[in-house]
């Protein structure tokens, strides 16, 4: 292959070479969220389209039923972006109303769970208070970071409110990961 | 090359190795856009530095009229933050005087066009309203996502106001890609 | 190699093919800082934990004394989040009272420092004024990009006011590197 | 594919109110302006003015300023154009048209909407 | 404002042979962009306007190559090289570079 005389002869190669294009990938979009029961004080989990629009799934990474599998041993960058939005937050009213002052808040979490461990792993959180004067609100919280997972790991998107997320478009709530 | 007998012999290989510093990469950051705009033009593109400073395009992704172009058919991740500053919103006027408060707000999109194709295709769009009580406001907006592109696809970054857009420094407001 | 074959000919190769594991990289999560001082109008760098939990180094990518080491020159994804939170901003206490209304604000930095160069490079800076009319709040400001680095560079990540970081769970702030 | 509605023929009497709608799919609606072109009964086209779908803020032309009135919903991605004191010279096809990226110029059109107006 | 005149009012043409309709207008249209947003449009009897030409020379999706446009300045021209049946309808040449935006007042074409 031309190129292989610049290899200097103490290059250490820990992993086969291969090439970028086979890589385990996914860019997933959201999708009209259909109300389930979940337990108290956990968050739900998005679920999201895998193949139309935008969206997609690569190289043996798999979506099924909320979850992304990967589907090999390496570092992945993860990412996701949910836009929420809602209606006046309670805090401005309560506010007005002389009462006690606890903002209202919005949280994303990109969980990993492993079959062997009992406890997801929460790998990103973006959570923002949301006390808004405007009688609509509307914002973004945009998560990603680097993360060595194993085959099998399963990964998803958990919302405080699956109610004020905005599904109606695909550039807006997506999450994805590629294998690095 | 040394470490290839750790290639098992199954492994299956879709594309041609290559080098990653082979791979068309670009970071362009902000610089103070010309007001001479089309009043129709309610969502413009924002034009960017390509060179100086720590802006740089390489291995023939290039920076021409506002877009990057696409000089090779593959999976990139794209990435971009929007810093907007402006003097407080209607939106809390409004409020004052009891009148319908719906909020102002700021929006960015990254959007691909192909030539091939008459409309422009969002990508990634963040959007927020804006209703500070402040008499100053800030705030950046961020996006990143991997796509699949096709060579000759051209990339742009839209805003909803290209006013409030901070243009005053290269870390505040910037458009990258890179193929992975 | 197998797959060899589908290389073309004219292939340029500008770089040693190596391995993606074995490329430089690092995820550093949130410590509780230790108040240290720092000078005037200069933002304080925090500190990381670099290998329990979610934290990594490897591939001679170091981390020693609140910087991240680049071992090897070539284009890198920088990304780093924090999480702060406060008490009602003074801006909202002020605006109450009447007086001008300067607003507070949270402020992000990833700085890279190259011996050999006197002063410190910005490379991404989030900036939020905040004017909050909670009583408490909290959010995230995140950034993430490319760019050219050399070895010997440090990165650091740099804070308005260490003392409104979020500093209680490793999903919360982050900051990693990757060579691409 | 980008898709304009309009709503029905209409007919007025002289000195009424119309309200004609224009609903729009296929493409994110805030992202382009919607113009309004009339065309009298055997004569050509004119551009009556447009609306920025994104801010709501109306531009009308010196002929169409007064009792037109450009509106949105958003919500359900359509465009509105008010005719208020009707005249029988109001008595055309309206069109709802909307802008494109690059060029602010009307490629989609919808399929007009007859107001007549008659006592 | 300015004005948009066209000329012929109205192009008689042979099926298969070419057909030239000009448009001038009373002053310059190029934006202070840059670009010169002088469009055409085609509307067939019964029809809603269809966009053929935008920024005077380049074709809209789906327009077929018989369809051309050129000038610059004050003086444009929309040529169809080979007219078919599908073609007969009135054309309108359109400025979109100063408010209010102006249309011409129309050519007819129709087959001999």
């Known amino acids: 292959l031309k190129g292989q005389e610049f290899a200097p002869s103490h290059q250490q190669v820990y992993a086969p070479l291969r090439a970028d294009g086979d890589k385990p990938r996914a860019h997933l979009t959201v999708v009209r969220q259909t109300p389930t029961q979940h337990f108290k004080n956990q968050f739900p989990a998005l679920h999201w389209e895998h193949e139309l629009g935008l969206a997609f799934t690569k190289n043996r990474m798999n979506y099924t039923n909320k979850f992304l599998l990967i589907p090999e041993s390496g570092d992945y960058f993860i990412y996701s972006q949910v836009t929420f939005r809602g209606m006046t937050s309670e805090c401005s009213e309560i506010r007005q109303a002389g009462r006690p002052n606890k903002p209202d808040s919005i949280t994303v979490v990109i969980t990993k769970v492993t079959d062997s461990y009992p406890e997801p792993t929460q790998l990103l959180m973006g959570t923002k208070s949301v006390c808004e004067v405007g009688s609509n609100w509307f914002q973004p919280i945009y998560l990603g970071a680097m993360f060595s997972l194993q085959e099998g790991d399963k990964l998803m998107v958990n919302v405080s409110d699956i109610s004020l997320v905005d599904y109606t478009k695909e550039d807006k709530t997506f999450f994805g990961a590629f294998l690095l | 090359l040394k470490g290839q007998e750790f290639a098992p012999s199954h492994q299956q290989v879709y594309a041609p190795l290559r080098a990653d510093g082979d791979k068309p990469r670009a970071h362009l950051t902000v610089v103070r856009q010309t007001p001479t705009q089309h009043f129709k033009n309610q969502f413009p593109a924002l034009h960017w530095e390509h060179e100086l400073g720590l802006a740089f395009t390489k291995n023939r992704m290039n920076y021409t009229n506002k877009f990057l172009l696409i000089p090779e058919s593959g999976d990139y991740f794209i990435y971009s933050q929007v810093t907007f500053r402006g003097m407080t919103s209607e939106c809390s006027e409004i409020r004052q005087a009891g009148r319908p408060n719906k909020p102002d707000s700021i929006t960015v999109v990254i959007t691909k066009v192909t030539d091939s194709y008459p409309e422009p295709t969002q990508l990634l769009m963040g959007t927020k309203s804006v209703c500070e009580v402040g008499s100053n406001w800030f705030q950046p907006i961020y996006l990143g996502a991997m796509f699949s592109l096709q060579e000759g696809d051209k990339l742009m970054v839209n805003v909803s106001d290209i006013s409030l857009v901070d243009y005053t420094k290269e870390d505040k407001t910037f458009f990258g890609a890179f193929l992975l | 190699l197998k797959g060899q074959e589908f290389a073309p000919s004219h292939q340029q190769v500008y770089a040693p093919l190596r391995a993606d594991g074995d490329k430089p990289r690092a995820h550093l999560t949130v410590v509780r800082q230790t108040p240290t001082q720092h000078f005037k109008n200069q933002f304080p760098a925090l500190h990381w934990e670099h290998e329990l939990g979610l934290a990594f180094t490897k591939n001679r990518m170091n981390y020693t004394n609140k910087f991240l080491l680049i071992p090897e020159s070539g284009d890198y994804f920088i990304y780093s989040q924090v999480t702060f939170r406060g008490m009602t901003s003074e801006c909202s206490e002020i605006r109450q009272a009447g007086r001008p209304n300067k607003p507070d604000s949270i402020t992000v930095v990833i700085t890279k420092v190259t011996d050999s160069y006197p002063e410190p490079t910005q490379l991404l800076m989030g900036t939020k004024s905040v004017c909050e009319v909670g009583s408490n709040w909290f959010q995230p400001i995140y950034l993430g990009a490319m760019f050219s680095l050399q070895e010997g560079d440090k990165l650091m990540v740099n804070v308005s006011d260490i003392s409104l970081v979020d500093y209680t769970k490793e999903d919360k702030t982050f900051f990693g590197a990757f060579l691409l | 594919q980008v898709q304009l509605v309009q709503s029905g023929s209409e007919l007025k009497k002289p000195g009424a109110s119309v309200k004609v709608s224009c609903k729009a799919s296929g493409y994110t609606f805030t992202l382009y302006g919607m113009n309004w072109v009339r065309q009298a009964p055997g004569q050509g086209l004119e551009w009556m003015g447009w609306?920025?779908?994104?801010?709501?803020?109306?531009t009308y032309a010196d002929d169409f300023k007064g009792r037109f009135v450009f509106s949105l919903d958003t919500s359900v991605s359509t465009a509105y154009l008010q005719i208020s004191s009707l005249k029988a010279e109001d008595t055309a096809v309206y069109y709802c048209?909307?802008?494109?990226?690059?060029?602010?110029?009307?490629?989609?059109w919808g399929q007009g909407t007859l107001v007549t107006v008659s006592s | 404002d300015v004005v948009m005149t066209q000329s012929p009012l109205s192009l008689p043409v042979t099926l298969g042979q070419p057909a030239s309709i000009s448009c001038k207008s009373s002053q310059n249209i190029v934006h202070s962009d840059g670009n010169t947003y002088l469009e055409w449009f085609q509307q067939r009897p019964g029809q809603s306007p269809r966009r053929l030409i935008y920024k005077v020379s380049n074709r809209f999706s789906g327009v077929p190559d018989r369809f051309s446009g050129s000038g610059s300045g004050t003086d444009f021209t929309l040529k169809i090289s080979r007219v078919e049946a599908e073609d007969v309808g009135v054309y309108y040449c359109f400025q979109g570079s100063h408010v209010p935006l102006t249309f011409g007042g129309g050519t007819k074409v129709e087959i001999k």
């Open positions: 609306i920025n779908t994104y801010t709501g803020e109306p």
């Open positions: 048209a909307r802008d494109t990226a690059m060029d602010y110029a009307m490629a989609y």
